[in-house]
């Protein structure tokens, strides 16, 4: 059967800081999260079946004044979907998206979402991971911050 | 045959107001809009065939000064794609996206688009609907504001 | 076999200017770029096989102060995915997205990405192209600026 995964953020273990970090805690079997014929391990989505896959990610950032003051009002809110090949140890960014934002104190609430998607050839054993900037600003809802993949066709 | 739908906004019936509302008027059979083996009824996209579907939405907001004065320059421009189960009356948000925006009077024109997409298990009889904030700012073009779904695979 | 394409920006030939232009230089056979059972010619992605396709585009814009001063700080950063029919010479926009932006000199770096996607009926011979505003601001990375398509199902 055609492999797929839809992984939602596990908010109990989101890193702090503003630098780019790899998000390693995702749900794969609760709520909207699900996986079939792929593996989730060590924060990475592992391909078990060669093929062409559509990959996607939706990342939401938010800040409310009750959470405290931002260290800077000028933010780079970014997502990077990367592929790592174990056989040839290397990591490459497949897709990136995001925006620079000025989240001023003039408003008590700020929100921003990124969506990326694309069609890629994946080989068994390759790993997909998601990196973001400013992870402490991530929206922890399952409808907000997630990524996934589904196989569309075989490699000829 | 595999079900699909691509529904485009029917701008003749867009609600006013700034609060979150469900958009119930969509075209399903003109221009780019089309549907097959799914049903559009009462503003909802009804699933007729169990399966895993890729769902997506593209929502564009715009304002030109000739349209009048905004009540606030600080806007939350949001979309929520929801699933309603009739058997167990409940509604859940599958995907959300958007941004807070400061649309100042210093510029005569403002525009912003949101795109969300994800892979979900849908059962026959379940309904997909789209909610937005500030519906009076929606771009009424068929290439701007739409949502859709296509079945990727059966449920094992 | 099911047709697909994933085309990445060829940054050696990006137009200048701020007006809307068609992007004609894309890679189809290096890095993440690939094509099968479709044709890339004269800057357009040509459909060789009737069907319903999922189309997508990811467009990133960026500016660093070291690149020089912007002619205006008020920008419309937009993408339009268009379909051209040769038999009936006409061009229509399938999808659009983007945002107006205020990229002030208060920040040395600015970034913004757009993602659009949708499900469309395409006939053999039809051509897909991508237009953007402010092409000189495009991010030339293959993970940043790309578009693609994959066939999901036949036309009944």
């Amino acid at each position: 059967a055609q492999p797929f995964a839809h992984l939602t953020i596990n908010a109990t273990n989101i890193p702090t800081g503003s630098h780019k970090v790899s998000l390693s805690s995702w749900y794969h079997d609760r709520g909207w999260a699900k996986i079939s014929n792929m593996t989730f391990s060590n924060g990475k989505l592992i391909v078990n079946q060669d093929g062409f896959y559509y990959l996607y990610a939706n990342i939401c950032f938010r800040h409310h004044e009750t959470s405290g003051d931002l260290a800077t009002e000028y933010l780079q809110l970014m997502v990077y979907v990367t592929k790592t090949s174990i056989k040839i140890p290397s990591s490459h960014t497949l897709m990136k998206g995001g925006s620079t934002k000025y989240w001023s104190g003039n408003s008590e609430f700020h929100f921003y979402s990124i969506n990326v998607g694309g069609f890629f050839k994946l080989r068994s054993g390759e790993e997909i991971s998601v990196e973001v900037s400013n992870p402490s600003l991530l929206d922890p809802d399952q409808d907000a911050t997630y990524f996934g993949a589904f196989k569309v066709r075989d490699i000829d | 045959a595999q079900p699909f739908a691509h529904l485009t906004i029917n701008a003749t019936n867009i609600p006013t107001g700034s609060h979150k509302v469900s958009l119930s008027s969509w075209y399903h059979d003109r221009g780019w809009a089309k549907i097959s083996n799914m049903t559009f009824s009462n503003g909802k996209l009804i699933v007729n065939q169990d399966g895993f579907y890729y769902l997506y939405a593209n929502i564009c907001f715009r304002h030109h000064e000739t349209s009048g004065d905004l009540a606030t320059e600080y806007l939350q421009l949001m979309v929520y794609v929801t699933k309603t189960s009739i058997k167990i009356p409940s509604s859940h948000t599958l995907m959300k996206g958007g941004s807070t925006k400061y649309w100042s009077g210093n510029s005569e024109f403002h525009f912003y688009s949101i795109n969300v997409g994800g892979f979900f298990k849908l059962r026959s009889g379940e309904e997909i609907s789209v909610e937005v904030s500030n519906p009076s700012l929606l771009d009424p073009d068929q290439d701007a504001t739409y949502f859709g779904a296509f079945k990727v695979r059966d449920i094992d | 076999a099911q047709p697909f394409a994933h085309l990445t920006i060829n940054a050696t030939n990006i137009p200048t200017g701020s007006h809307k232009v068609s992007l004609s230089s894309w890679y189809h056979d290096r890095g993440w770029a690939k094509i099968s059972n479709m044709t890339f010619s004269n800057g357009k992605l040509i459909v060789n096989q009737d069907g319903f396709y999922y189309l997508y585009a990811n467009i990133c814009f960026r500016h660093h102060e070291t690149s020089g001063d912007l002619a205006t700080e008020y920008l419309q950063l937009m993408v339009y995915v268009t379909k051209t029919s040769i038999k009936i010479p006409s061009s229509h926009t399938l999808m659009k997205g983007g945002s107006t932006k205020y990229w002030s000199g208060n920040s040395e770096f600015h970034f913004y990405s757009i993602n659009v996607g949708g499900f469309f009926k395409l006939r053999s011979g039809e051509e897909i192209s991508v237009e953007v505003s402010n092409p000189s601001l495009l991010d030339p990375d293959q993970d940043a600026t790309y578009f693609g398509a994959f066939k999901v199902r036949d036309i009944d």
Partner: nanobody
């Protein structure tokens, strides 16, 4: 649960001043357009004033023009109603509401255009 809370009312002599405030809790309304209304016993709710989210535009009811001023802090809550040169006919319960439209319409002075009313604050002006 969304709540608006009005405060600052009281008893004041004619010619005096009061400053009312309207604070929102439960959801982000800090930058919504807001309206002040009042209701005297046995009378309909009457429009007092309106302020946009940025504070850049204000409108007033005819009976309070030149005496009342609506303002808001540069950033967040609350929205204020500064009432000067008070008259006995200003006696009423004062309410604030969140304007429900994206655009300012000609009906901004109608109470039906507002949501999330608070409990009100009593203002009594003695002669």
């Amino acid at each position: 649960e969304v709540q608006l809370v009005e405060s600052g009312g009281g008893l004041v002599q004619a010619g005096g001043s009061l400053r009312l405030s309207c604070a929102a809790s439960g959801r982000t309304f800090s930058r919504s357009a807001m309206g002040w209304f009042r209701q005297a016993p046995g009378k309909e709710r009457e429009f007092v004033g309106f302020i946009t989210g940025s504070g850049g535009t204000t409108y007033y009811g005819e009976s309070v023009k030149g005496r009342f001023t609506i303002s808001r802090d540069n950033a967040q809550n609350p929205v204020y109603l500064q009432m000067n040169s008070l008259k006995p006919e200003d006696t009423a319960v004062y309410y604030c509401g969140v304007y429900r439209r994206t655009y300012i319409s000609s009906t901004y002075s109608e109470s039906s255009e507002y949501d999330y009313w608070g409990q009100g604050t009593q203002v009594t002006v003695s002669s």
